[in-house]
């Protein structure tokens, strides 16, 4: 393992590598640790403000975590010759607030990308597709990890955060080969319609620890390869028949529904019936009611139709203050 730990006197990293000299095959950038045997470069917790230009050509796994990158420009990893072996890129916790279109272009082997724990005020629609064409060249990405990328409220753009992320996921249909998508802990209130329709190859989808209230307008129908769907720790109140039927129709899926505030009233009857007969839900015996108060902590699987009633709504003429 070689490492280069230089002081502040080391030459600053260039913003663009277009004019940079090709790196020596075994060169290790300042402030990084390199292992050619493991094909790994780690530039971790070094307060880097830019991606090193002189990354070794052998790099297959690149860790740029815990830095202060702020912005990933177009072609941030473009090199001559290209980093043709780079397969896994971890940029988590690097204070990124802007990822521009084409940021990951010229990485032909990039299979796994982790942008978690960056407060992304701006994620270009073309961050992953690289172009604004209606149909882009397929991205090589197989795993995309976007946990906790929601910016603080004061840094949000006018448009919805959910919409911004969705636009990047569907642009150019570039991510049709994506197998794994993690979107946990992003304060999502809803999942934009048609996003999942553009991701037909998903095997693993993590939407846990968001604020999803309903899945009524979400279609899982075409996710025929889905094996794990994580919906724990959301704000789901009930799953309606359409959603239940779609989940039941997915041949290999397992759904995780723990820690949602299930409302056990008359609208819950179909879901309870479904839970009792389905093998789709993992840990279904742990699901409990949160509302109404009289039902709190009751186990869904133990409920029957007589338990699930709705208070009659008084006609306006009978309502009193």
């Amino acid at each position: 393992t070689s490492s280069a730990s230089s002081s502040s006197s080391s030459a600053p990293f260039l913003a663009s590598a277009a004019s940079a000299q090709p790196p020596l095959p075994d060169q290790c950038p300042a402030l990084c640790e390199c292992s050619e045997a493991a094909r790994t470069v780690k530039c971790v917790n070094r307060n880097l403000t830019e991606v090193p230009t002189d990354l070794p050509l052998y790099v297959r796994n690149l860790f740029l975590t815990g830095n202060q990158l702020a912005v990933l420009p177009a072609g941030a990893f473009a090199r001559r010759p290209p980093l043709a072996e780079l397969a896994a890129l971890n940029l988590s916790g690097s204070r990124l607030d802007e990822v521009r279109g084409g940021a990951f272009e010229h990485l032909p082997s990039l299979r796994q990308l982790d942008l978690s724990h960056n407060p992304l005020a701006y994620l270009s629609p073309f961050a992953f597709s690289g172009s604004n064409a209606s149909i882009s060249a397929p991205s090589p990405l197989v795993e995309l990890i976007l946990n906790h990328i929601v910016p603080p409220d004061d840094k949000r753009q006018n448009r919805s955060f959910e919409g911004m992320v969705a636009a990047a996921l569907v642009a150019g249909r570039a991510l049709q080969g994506l197998h794994l998508l993690e979107l946990a802990s992003n304060h999502f209130l809803y999942l934009p319609r048609d996003v999942l329709a553009q991701l037909p190859s998903l095997r693993y989808l993590d939407l846990s620890n968001n604020s999803l209230v309903s899945l009524t307008y979400v279609s899982f129908r075409n996710l025929t390869h889905l094996e794990s769907l994580h919906l724990e720790d959301n704000a789901l109140k009930v799953l309606h028949n359409g959603t239940l039927a779609e989940l039941q129709g997915l041949p290999h899926v397992r759904v995780f529904l723990d820690n949602n505030p299930w409302v056990c009233d008359c609208h819950m009857a179909d879901m309870v019936t479904w839970l009792k007969q389905t093998g789709v839900v993992q840990g279904k015996d742990r699901l409990t009611c949160a509302f109404p108060e009289k039902m709190r902590n009751r186990v869904l699987l133990e409920l029957n139709s007589a338990d699930l009633d709705c208070d009659p709504i008084l006609p306006p003429s009978l309502q009193t203050s």
Partner: antibody
Framework: EVQLVQSGAEVKKPGESLKISCKGS????????IGWVRQMPGKGLEWMGI????????RYSPSFQGQVTISADKSISTAYLQWSSLKASDTGMYYC????????WGQGTLVTVSS | AIQLTQSPSSLSASVGDRVTITCRAS??????LAWYQQKPGKAPKLLIY???NLESGVPSRFSGSGSGTDFTLTISSLQPEDFATYYC?????????FGQGTKLEIK
């Protein structure tokens, strides 16, 4: 990096029992199905069955139902294929593979059953 | 169980040739078909799924087509590393059967 590492080659006599293993790493083992495939010497691939390690739900090919048992221990990220009474016709290479679409494969375990 | 029949069982071709392998299902399997490549002494490798979707990292000279019961794998310009055995597999219903294989040899 996703890896499936299988146990080593086995030489057994007819009637003996055997349990071979497949250890997954580099991914969430409990979140993807794991399948087993047999390849007899000089022959093609045969789908034996799959298991979801998260809840040990297993599906078998009718050709192998009752002949083998597929199991998993999620605490050590390992899937198993076992026989209670081997036959000479069980000789072959056995592969484990991840996901219903077998996107990653183990290196194979050669099982030889001979008296 | 759904049966898959590949043809031809073996095939001789030269580098640069265009090669087509077919797979016929005994009943309709929608688009639930995959193709694998296996080289001697190695584990198989997923090439294509859902009839025509290329697995990440697979060269674009490989392509798949078809629907219902009849499917094809095409290699547009054979490379030396493509000489291997190819299998189709259906995952429309259990058991997820394989075809018997097509051995692609150097002419």
């Amino acid at each position: 990096e996703v890896q499936l590492v299988q146990s080593g080659a086995e030489v057994k006599k007819p009637g003996e029992s055997l349990k071979i293993s497949c250890k997954g790493s580099g991914y969430r083992f409990t979140s993807y199905w794991i399948g087993w495939v047999r390849q007899m010497p000089g022959k093609g691939l045969e789908w034996m069955g799959i298991i979801y390690p998260g809840d040990s739900d297993a599906r078998y090919s009718p050709s192998f139902q009752g002949q083998v048992t597929i199991s998993a221990d999620k605490s050590i990220s390992t899937a198993y294929l076992q026989w209670s009474s081997l036959k000479a016709s069980d000789t072959g290479m056995y592969y484990c593979a991840r996901s219903v679409l077998f996107d990653y494969w183990g290196q194979g375990t050669l099982v030889t059953v001979s008296s | 169980a759904i049966q898959l029949t590949q043809s031809p069982s073996s095939l001789s071709a030269s580098v640069g040739d265009r090669v087509t392998i077919t797979c016929r299902a005994s009943q309709g399997i929608s688009s639930a078909l995959a193709w694998y490549q296996q080289k001697p002494g190695k584990a198989p490798k997923l090439l294509i799924y859902d009839v025509s979707n290329l697995e990440s990292g697979v060269p674009s000279r490989f392509s798949g087509s078809g629907s219902g019961t009849d499917f094809t794998l095409t290699i547009s310009s054979l490379q030396p590393e493509d000489f291997a055995t190819y299998y189709c597999q259906q995952f429309n219903s259990y058991p997820h059967t394989f075809g018997q294989g097509t051995k692609l040899e150097i002419k």
